[in-house]
């Protein structure tokens, strides 16, 4: 950055390099260049002259004053018009930034993602800070009172091979920037309480064609938790208003669900699960379109990347899906 | 890739007990899964016996409970097999296998066979 | 406990013929049925769970079907390395239960 160029004097801020946004600031500028009284001092933002708000305040002094500074980042410098030479000399330059201390960090919400061997920790950072900003996740054992410190800028992924200080856990998020420093409340968290199942995925879709036609879609997941809580919700692709059916799921075999669904209408399907009595939720799997027959019976299926989810059977049409067995997004 | 490996005593007396440990590699114990041991008995037999969660906790067969203990060793990346009070009857080959999800066991150690004899 | 029945222990079949094999659950499994093949002086490899689904790598040639109690393993060309004992598995749920096994010849 202009950090690192070789200085003929100094530069510097008031209040501070780092300051909050829509501060009042002043830059200083103090040549110390051989065999030169400086006629004038300039200073740039950007590489772009400024024009106003300057004020010499002694022989190899000034001042460039701003009000209500909104830039989160800003290159300055300043030069000095020399006597006897053509160009202007390089004083010195400086980075400014500006910005807010952080917001408490809020809800706070600890997951595990089946499979992924990391427990994963999130919170709401509140406004924009425009600077760095780093957040340090303390997790303390209810058991053993041992406690880890993790440093990062955003979220965490913690392996649940290094908690080993038993199944219970407080943690909390501290936010700290040059501006200011905040801690989050403490969430209480049991590592048997916070896991996610295995990704719920829609692999197929087929509807008989009987006195009543009827749709079977067919869902699965790889969970080992045997007991699980499922919504599937579905809709005409031409409505707003999703229909949701609730079950409770044994996933020791691929599920087959019915539907009654009107004839000749493009559907669409979407699943999401969860550990039955637990609090949070898988994020809604992707979409998975049907449509209804008019009369023949019709097949839908996603052929995944991972042959284990190809059925074998006939299919009329096929679209592409991905399994993973790291679900990540919204937590519900 | 995923490899689970058995290794044990070929030989073991009546009355005493049995150890067995499968080492896998390709993939941490603690991250997923259930882990089993199933045997096979000279007559091509095959019989479940239990298994560990990931999470440590186990699940065995009743007809073998009284008798028989699934443990782990994280830091080596191991889990045991202890059956105790063993007869000729335990004469049989024995493997560790990797459940998919709640369904079939998808992964199988190429077996350690095991003599029960005095 | 479910015990799984399969009433053939030998099957002898010629290359290119289509092959099937039956498995009967003592009680309702669902569609919680896996299909495995085994070839001597190695652990048994994985085909078919969840009654119809093939694993990865499994060649379409192999297919599985059934629900409930009855559940069909078939073979739809036979080629010669198919020559193995092919076990079914309830995992339906524990204590789970396998099949005495069925062992495919070729002629």
């Known amino acids: 950055g202009i950090t690192n160029i070789n200085c003929s004097g100094h530069i510097w801020v008031e209040p501070a390099t780092i300051f909050k946004m829509g501060m009042n600031i002043s830059i200083y500028c103090q040549a110390a260049i051989k065999n030169c009284q400086p006629r004038k001092l300039h200073f740039y933002k950007n590489g772009i002259k400024e024009r106003f708000q300057i004020t010499r305040i002694n022989k190899t002094t000034a001042r460039l004053w701003y009000k209500n500074f909104l830039e989160p980042h800003a290159s300055m410098y300043c030069t000095a018009e020399c006597p006897k030479h053509f160009q202007e000399t390089l004083i010195c330059g400086k980075d400014i930034s500006s910005g807010y201390p952080p917001d408490i960090p809020d809800e706070v919400t600890c997951v595990i993602y089946e499979y992924s061997g990391n427990m994963t920790c999130t919170w709401n950072a509140g406004k924009l800070t425009y600077i760095d900003t780093k957040y340090v996740v303390h997790v303390k054992s209810l058991e053993t009172e041992e406690e880890q410190q993790y440093l990062t800028s955003s979220y965490i992924n913690i392996s649940t091979d290094s908690l080993q200080g038993g199944k219970k856990y407080l943690v909390w998020v501290q936010a700290a920037n040059a501006l200011g420093m905040e801690e989050s409340k403490q969430l209480q968290i049991h590592l048997d309480d916070i896991v996610i199942p295995s990704a719920a995925v829609i692999s197929r879709a087929e509807t008989i064609n009987a006195t009543v036609p009827k749709t079977i879609i067919y869902w699965d997941s790889q969970t080992t938790i045997e007991k699980v809580s499922c919504e599937m919700r579905y809709k005409a692709t031409t409505n707003q208003t999703w229909n949701v059916k609730e079950f409770d799921t044994n996933f020791t075999y691929v599920q087959q669900s019915e539907f009654y669904l009107e004839p000749n209408i493009k559907y669409v399907f979407q699943v999401r699960c969860q550990e039955t009595g637990k609090r949070y939720w898988q994020p809604w799997s992707s979409l998975f379109f049907h449509k209804t027959p008019e009369t023949v019976p019709q097949v839908t299926s996603k052929a995944f990347q991972h042959d284990t989810w190809n059925s074998g059977l006939t299919v009329a049409s096929i679209s592409t899906g991905h399994l993973t067995s790291d679900n990540r997004g919204d937590i519900g | 890739d995923v490899q689970l490996q058995e290794s044990g005593p070929d030989l073991v007396k009546p009355s005493q007990s049995l150890s067995l440990t499968c080492t896998v590699t390709?993939?941490?114990?603690?991250?997923?899964?259930?882990w089993h041991w199933i045997r096979q008995f000279p007559g091509n037999k095959l019989e479940w016996m239990g298994y560990i969660h990931s999470s440590g906790t186990t699940n065995y067969s009743p007809s073998l409970r009284s008798r028989l203990s699934i443990t782990r060793d994280t830091s080596k990346n191991q889990f045991f097999l202890q059956l105790n009070s063993v007869t000729t009857e335990d004469t049989a080959t024995y493997y560790c296998?990797?459940?998919?999800?709640?369904?079939?066991?998808?992964?199988w150690g190429q077996g350690t066979t095991l003599t029960v004899s005095s | 406990d479910i015990v799984m029945t399969q009433s053939h222990k030998f099957m002898s079949t010629s290359v290119g013929d289509r092959v099937s094999l039956t498995c009967k659950a003592s009680?309702?499994?669902?569609?919680?049925v896996a299909w495995y093949q085994q070839k001597p002086g190695q652990p048994p490899k994985l085909l078919i769970y969840?009654?119809?689904y093939r694993y990865t790598g499994v060649p379409d040639r192999f297919t599985g079907s059934g629900s409930g109690t009855d559940f069909t393993f078939t073979i739809i060309s036979v080629q010669a390395e198919d020559l193995a004992v092919y076990y079914c598995?309830?995992?339906?749920?524990?204590?789970?239960?396998f099949g005495s096994g069925t062992k495919l010849e070729i002629k």
């Open positions: 009680q309702e499994v669902r569609t919680a």
């Open positions: 390709g993939y941490s114990i603690t991250s997923g899964y259930n």
């Open positions: 969840s009654a119809s």
């Open positions: 296998t990797r459940q998919l999800g709640l369904k079939a066991m998808e992964y």
């Open positions: 598995q309830q995992h339906y749920t524990t204590p789970y239960s």
